[in-house]
Interface confidence: medium
């Protein structure tokens, strides 16, 4: 009888563990969906506002190829920076290539000098992997040079010619990016 009760208890425990795993997966999925939704809204907002504007980029944004960039005027923590970009139909900068990195660092030198600028890169708390905001991994040449010693969440930033990492709660300037409007000519 005791063995039977013990077996049932173990089965229930196993079931509970499975449910917890499912809940965790669902929570992750929900978070991912919320982020995707934000991206869609940002993209739609960008498309609509651009339709009323003949120039490829809004005032005070810098254009390079198909992208428009905005360099912030005040400091923010990483999460607030991302919110600010999303509000403007853009996202924190996602660096796709060395060419883009060179353009950004060259432009920053001209505009502001050697400060810290948040980009859309953060470290996954569980796996320690670096991820851009769209969930993709940076190319090997674009991984932050130094691993932050912070016990808190770690995010990526650009300084001079380097991609570095820091506690996401520190204050930095930030860079937003959105698609440039294609000329209809």
């Amino acid at each position: 009888k005791l063995l039977q009760v013990s077996t049932i208890a173990m089965q229930q425990q196993e079931k509970l563990i499975q449910q917890e795993r499912a809940l965790l997966n669902f929570t992750e999925w929900k978070r991912s969906c919320a982020l995707q939704m934000k991206y869609c809204q940002a993209f739609m907002q960008n498309s609509l506002s651009s339709a009323h504007n003949s120039s490829p980029c809004p005032n005070n944004w810098i254009q390079n190829r198909e992208s428009c960039y905005y360099v912030s005027e005040i400091w923010s923590i990483w999460h607030t920076s991302q919110e600010n970009c999303l509000k403007e139909g853009s996202t924190l900068l996602q660096i796709e290539s060395k060419e883009e990195m060179d353009f950004i660092t060259g432009s920053l030198r001209k505009i502001k000098g050697s400060y810290d600028y948040w980009v859309g890169l953060s470290q996954d708390g569980h796996s320690g992997r670096w991820l851009w905001q769209d969930g993709s991994s940076p190319s090997p040449g674009l991984l932050p040079a130094e691993r932050s010693q912070s016990a808190n969440q770690v995010c990526g930033y650009v300084k001079s010619n380097s991609l570095l990492s820091s506690n996401c709660s520190t204050w930095k300037y930030f860079i937003c990016e959105k698609y440039a409007l294609r000329s209809s000519v």
Epitope: P58, E73, I74, E88
Partner: nanobody, 117 residues
Framework: QVQLVESGGESVQAGGSLRLSCAAS????????MAWSRQAPGKEREFVAR????????DYADSVKGRFTISRDNAKNTVYLQMNSLKPEDTAIYNC??????????SGQGTQVTVSS
């Protein structure tokens, strides 16, 4: 076009208090982050405090934490910086700034704070 006008800066003794105000005109600033920064002669600009549009989130530089308080009155389109336990190293020109996309850097002319020992 947004105009920002700072006021309230003056000379005080170390340990004293001041309240700086930043009045905005030309546009409602209630949706925008606001910040106070300062620059002492020969030094780089330093951001000392930031407040979110709704006023629910504030951040402070380590050098002023526990002494300075940023607040805003969106009905009056004004942001404040309450500065207590002032130190000589707080001497600087204080500017208020706002983050408005698609616009130049909106920053006032500044107000001078001098703290003597």
């Amino acid at each position: 076009q947004v105009q920002l006008v700072e006021s309230g800066g003056e000379s005080v003794q170390a340990g004293g208090s001041l309240r700086l105000s930043c009045a905005a005109s030309g546009r409602t600033i209630s949706n925008y982050d606001m910040a106070w920064s300062r620059q002492a002669p020969g030094k780089e600009r330093e951001f000392v405090a930031r407040i979110s549009g709704s006023g629910d989130r504030t951040d402070y530089a380590d050098s002023v934490k526990g002494r300075f308080t940023i607040s805003r009155d969106n009905a009056k389109n004004t942001v404040y910086l309450q500065m207590n336990s002032l130190k000589p190293e707080d001497t600087a020109i204080y500017n208020c700034q706002t983050q408005i996309f698609g616009s130049p850097n909106f920053s006032g002319q500044g107000t001078q704070v001098t703290v003597s020992s």
